[in-house]
Interface confidence: medium
């Protein structure tokens, strides 16, 4: 069974899964208001976002008192954050501004890829091997959306029998879409695309809010028991809380290399020609390349126009 | 509807246990934590703590540690508050109230009609 | 633990006025804070969450606002049934706390 990495709003901790009665260990303390977590396992860096300082920040896993000011500027309510670990970006949703931004691992070059038909977007999850993210929106038009990584194919994947999608997970191995729904109080599953969709766990869940798996196990916080919950994700048997009494379970992730395979990453050779970002596609040759928000892509398809 | 029926007043002798109950109807019991709160005569209102019936996760307000314990019969979707060694200071009017949780937020939406307490020989 | 300060402890106001009952916050809440409604004899009733969202139900004359230490209930044109005890409550942190109240009186 894996860690589980979670924030806790005041602070980021560290649990094991198979050891959940056992006190979490505080990776980052003394926080604000930390929602959004994730991490990129290779390079030992954890990012979180706060919600009251609007900022997203990072840490080096092994190092104390290494933290680093990634963005700083133009975020209102981040809620949601991925890093792509392949092409070494960081994505963000924030349901205040309504945008969907990624920059470098560093916040430099950050571009808004949508703007948009975004009311509250939260969870983001990427699927950097096929190109693809996809992201929760719990707004007045509730729905599940996909898109290329690169900005391009947007489409609403999920938007029946939805109303607070908060969770959002991927089951690489299994090419499966997993969500949790904070008003419906279910945890359902679809292909990628959204189709074949099924419930694993009906309607009885109090306050489902971040979703994570590991192997054969779904693990999600639950706001209103103030807890980590597991289950089969088949079958949704097996469900059992495995870590409670925490003071604000937010964002959730399997903290382990398993959950960040290796695959080829198409901008890995000088950043695939690119000047300025190299966002990988949906489509051949799977990586665009673009340039930080105000600033023209050249007809070249690889630079930007100086000034960037 | 949503509603909290708390049971009726206590007489209570200094030194004795008391326990009051708060019967929830119209919800899912076990989807929301139940808080209990203090209301001294003079007005002011405190926090005791929560139960979640989930779970049977209890909060409890330092302050009340080894004075309130909380309780539940989910067969009746009824939380209970025991007060022990009660002294004058326990008279006071106590609700129990749901706690909500919004997609963003939580606060306690609806209140019970409370149980008054009085302490005295 | 946090400690929530409504400084006005009573009230005076006639019918039809506007009136702005204040609460201030030890430390930084964010925006957890809640405001109730408790008429003479009765339960309170929530009125606003999160600061300045109002509940289901409640009269669009109460208005929350305020973010971090202060916040401000506003109650305009003022009817007689607002006549009541109004209390803050801050549930950014355990122990929750409620303000000590404030009584609006109707001249």
């Known amino acids: 069974a894996p860690l589980l990495l979670y924030a806790n709003r005041r602070d980021l901790r560290l649990v094991d899964a198979t050891n959940g009665k056992e006190n979490a260990t505080i990776v980052v303390g003394g926080l604000e208001d930390a929602a959004a977590v994730d991490f990129v396992f290779s390079h030992g860096l954890i990012y979180w976002s706060d919600v009251s300082e609007e900022a997203i920040k990072r840490t080096e896993f092994n190092k104390t008192e290494s933290v680093q000011n990634v963005v700083v500027s133009g975020l209102l309510s981040p809620d949601g954050l991925a890093c792509d670990w392949l092409g070494e970006k960081l994505y963000w949703t924030d349901s205040e501004t309504n945008r969907i931004e990624v920059s470098n691992l560093d916040g430099s070059l950050r571009k808004v890829l949508f703007w948009q038909e975004l009311d509250q977007p939260r969870a983001i999850a990427l699927d950097p091997s096929s190109g693809f993210m996809y992201w929760t929106d719990w707004g007045e038009v509730p729905k599940i959306e996909r898109a290329g990584m690169d900005g391009s194919s947007r489409f609403i994947i999920i938007n029946s029998e939805i109303y607070w999608p908060n969770g959002l997970t991927l089951d690489y191995e299994e090419q499966k879409l997993y969500w949790a729904d904070a008003k419906l109080n279910f945890i359902h599953k679809s292909n990628l695309d959204g189709t074949n969709r099924q419930a694993v766990v009906k309607g009885s869940l109090p306050h489902p809010f971040a979703l994570t798996l590991f192997e054969d196990i779904l693990y999600w916080t639950d706001w209103s028991t103030h807890s980590i919950l597991a289950c089969n994700k088949y079958t949704g048997e097996g469900l059992r809380e495995i870590h409670s009494d925490i003071f604000s379970p937010m964002d959730i992730h399997a903290f382990s290399q398993q959950r960040q395979p290796n695959a080829t990453n198409p901008c890995g050779i000088d950043n695939g020609g690119c000047s300025h970002l190299c966002l990988m596609s949906p489509v051949k040759p799977f990586y665009q390349c673009a340039c930080p928000t105000g600033v023209k892509l050249l007809e070249n398809g690889k630079t930007c126009k100086d000034g960037a | 509807q949503v509603q909290l029926q708390q049971s009726g007043a206590e007489l209570v002798k200094p030194g004795a246990s008391v326990k009051m109950s708060c019967k929830a109807f119209?919800?899912?019991?076990?989807?929301?934590?139940i808080e209990w709160m203090k209301q001294n005569h003079g007005k002011s209102l405190e926090w005791i703590g929560n139960?979640?019936?989930?779970?049977?996760?209890?909060k409890y307000n330092e302050k009340f540690k080894g004075k309130a314990k909380l309780t539940v019969e989910k067969s009746s979707s009824t939380v209970y508050l025991e007060l022990s060694r009660s002294t004058s200071d326990d008279s006071a009017v106590y609700y129990c109230?749901?706690?909500?949780?919004?997609?963003?937020?939580?606060?306690?939406?609806?209140w019970g009609q409370g149980t008054s307490v009085t302490v005295s020989s | 633990d946090i400690v929530m300060t409504q400084s006005q402890k009573f009230m005076s106001t006639s019918v039809g006025d506007r009136v702005s009952i204040t609460c201030k916050a030890s430390?930084?809440?964010?925006?957890?804070v809640a405001w109730y409604q408790q008429k003479p004899g009765q339960s309170p009733k929530s009125l606003i969450y999160?600061?300045?969202n109002r509940h289901t139900g409640v009269p669009d004359r109460f208005t929350g606002s305020g973010s971090g230490t202060d916040f401000t209930l506003t109650i305009s044109n003022v009817q007689s049934e607002d006549l009541a005890d109004y209390f803050c409550?801050?549930?950014?942190?355990?122990?929750?706390?409620f303000g000590g109240g404030t009584k609006l009186e109707i001249k």
């Open positions: 139960f979640h019936p989930y779970n049977d996760n209890t």
């Open positions: 109230a749901r706690g909500y949780s919004g997609n963003y937020f939580s606060a306690m939406d609806y």
């Open positions: 430390q930084n809440v964010r925006n957890d």
């Open positions: 999160l600061a300045s």
């Open positions: 409550l801050q549930h950014w942190n355990y122990p929750y706390t």
């Open positions: 119209g919800y899912t019991f076990t989807s929301y934590p």
